[in-house]
């Protein structure tokens, strides 16, 4: 039989192995949202293996969605050329792995794992089902492939082989940013503060990018998105320690860790808050 | 071409136990997740339990979780299903599935005949 | 936790489009599966999101959107008499559910 038979329509065996994602959003299904706005926006296809295009109507929808086909690519795919033969570079976590457990506000009982920056290892922890933060996998073998060092101190990937050109941060790179301030932080840290469909009003906090201060705003208490801290101090701890002040062109103010050359930049024009 | 082969299925008394074995062949095992999947005579399919390709994750519905025993050996191509403390509603036919691709989050692609178990005093 | 639920039987005449619902809370934005049973065989695999497995008639498409998927079968014929299931992956809790089945009867 042809191998065509065995894999269907989607991928031969002699094309690809079977897909080992990144993270775990990579599989869900491009979801437009129930809002009506017509933005171009980038999904992983499981199926075809590739990222592709999508309308996302404006608010809720999920993390498989990215600004550009390039951030979705570094996201979400693992090409021959991300991978090179161990050398004795230190490859950087990506910075959520640094942020602290979140189960979040909801009241499921979900397994998941974390990075725990404290004992440099993934550990078992329960997410109650909604908001938290990307440190978070499905897998124990999720988290230890894209937070934990490997043996000799490497950090690599389900092959064995080092991770090499990853975009470790999460923000949108198609993007202006103030020349002051590089962020590197949790994407969702940059998406508008969203009331949400509901009719309650809860007092929450979410990160303002532009001004890099955490700020309160009225939650409906329900939808919105992933911008909604219950405390200052949370939505502090989450989105702040993203950005990184510059002192000159080249030059970073010191910071607990070293960043990647790659320069992130987020969007000054389409930050507000929405439903205020 | 993808064949999977069940046995091991059998009658057994309430609180017994089983091995279930699925042989696979006609495709890289060791590259795909593997599931086994039940249908109680008369009626719908339901979700027993997933493991992904390495072994190292493994997935179980609540109505087996701490019963079943789901393991895989890619040197022998061969998928287990070891089921302890049966109980009369998990008679079934058991069918092994492949899902299509590492991760448990594929679809089942190609099934087995399925073996039936019968839990009867 | 998703619940899939659909119709337990559908009927349609040789020739005619048959269509089998399968609803659960935002579907739409989740994967649904369609799998074919016949009587004594396993399931076989006839849709994944809107796709189309090698092998699989032309005649068998799939639709996904807001609370409901639909499996449709045009030009419906003997040999599609089967029961179908839906399927999709919650990836919440990490489990895979089927809707209850549809016996899919052809007059």
């Known amino acids: 039989d042809s191998e065509e038979d065995e894999e269907h329509t989607i991928i031969t065996d002699t094309e690809l192995p079977p897909l080992k994602l990144m993270h775990s959003f990579c599989a869900f299904k491009a979801d437009d949202g129930p809002c009506k706005a017509i933005m171009k926006r980038f999904f992983f296809n499981i199926f075809t293996r590739q990222c592709e295009e999508f309308i996302y109507g404006g608010c809720e929808g999920n993390q498989n969605r990215f600004e550009s086909l390039e951030e979705c690519k570094k996201m979400c795919t693992r090409d021959n050329a991300n991978r090179i033969i161990k050398t004795t570079l230190q490859q950087e976590k990506p910075d959520f792995c640094f942020l602290e457990e979140d189960p979040g506000i909801c009241r499921g009982y979900i397994t998941r794992y974390f990075y725990n920056n404290q004992t440099k290892q993934c550990e078992r922890f329960k997410y109650g089902g909604c908001l938290g933060n990307m440190n978070n996998f499905e897998t124990l073998e999720e988290c230890k492939n894209i937070c934990e060092d490997g043996p000799n101190g490497f950090q690599v990937d389900n092959y064995g082989t080092q991770l090499n050109a990853v975009n470790n941060s999460l923000t949108p790179q198609s993007t202006k940013v103030p020349s002051l301030f590089e962020f590197h932080g949790p994407s969702w840290c940059l998406t508008p503060a969203d009331r949400g469909l509901c009719r309650a009003n809860e007092n929450r906090f979410y990160y303002n990018s532009v001004i890099g201060k955490c700020r309160p705003f009225k939650y409906s208490g329900c939808g919105g998105n992933e911008n909604n801290f219950t405390s200052k101090q949370e939505c502090l701890r989450a989105c702040k320690k993203g950005f990184i002040q510059r002192i000159s062109k080249g030059g970073l103010i010191k910071t607990k860790r070293k960043r990647k050359k790659q320069r992130v930049k987020i969007a000054y024009e389409e930050i507000f808050v929405k439903n205020m | 071409q993808v064949q999977l082969v069940e046995s091991g299925g059998g009658l057994v008394q309430p609180g017994g136990s089983l091995r279930l074995s699925c042989a696979a062949s006609?495709?890289?095992?060791?590259?795909?997740?593997m599931s086994w999947v039940r249908q109680a005579p008369g009626k719908g399919l339901e979700w027993v339990s997933s493991?992904?390709?390495?072994?190292?994750?493994?997935y179980y519905a609540d109505s087996v979780k701490g019963r079943f025993t789901i393991s895989r050996d890619n040197s022998k191509n061969t998928l287990y299903l070891q089921m302890n403390s049966l109980r009369a509603e998990d008679t079934a036919v058991y069918y092994c599935?492949?899902?299509?691709?590492?991760?448990?989050?594929?679809?089942?692609?190609?099934w087995g005949q399925g073996t039936l178990v019968t839990v009867s005093s | 936790d998703i619940e899939l639920t659909q119709p337990p039987s559908v009927s349609v005449a040789p020739g005619q489009t048959a269509r089998i619902s399968c609803s659960g809370d935002?579907?739409?934005?989740?994967?649904v599966y369609w799998y074919q049973q016949k009587p004594g065989q396993a399931p076989v695999l006839v849709i994944y999101?809107?796709n189309r497995p090698s092998g699989i008639p032309e005649r068998f498409s799939g639709s996904n959107s807001g609370n409901t998927a639909t499996l449709t079968i045009s030009g419906t014929q003997a040999e599609d008499e089967a029961d179908y299931y839906c399927?999709?992956?919650?990836?919440?809790?990490?489990?895979?559910?089927f809707g209850g089945g549809t016996k899919l009867t052809v007059l």
């Open positions: 599935a492949r899902l299509m691709g590492y991760g448990h989050y594929y679809p089942f692609d190609y």
């Open positions: 006609g495709f890289t095992f060791s590259r795909y997740a």
């Open positions: 493991i992904i390709s390495s072994s190292s994750e493994t």
């Open positions: 935002k579907i739409g934005s989740k994967y």
């Open positions: 999101d809107s």
């Open positions: 399927a999709s992956y919650d990836s919440i809790y990490s489990y895979w559910v």
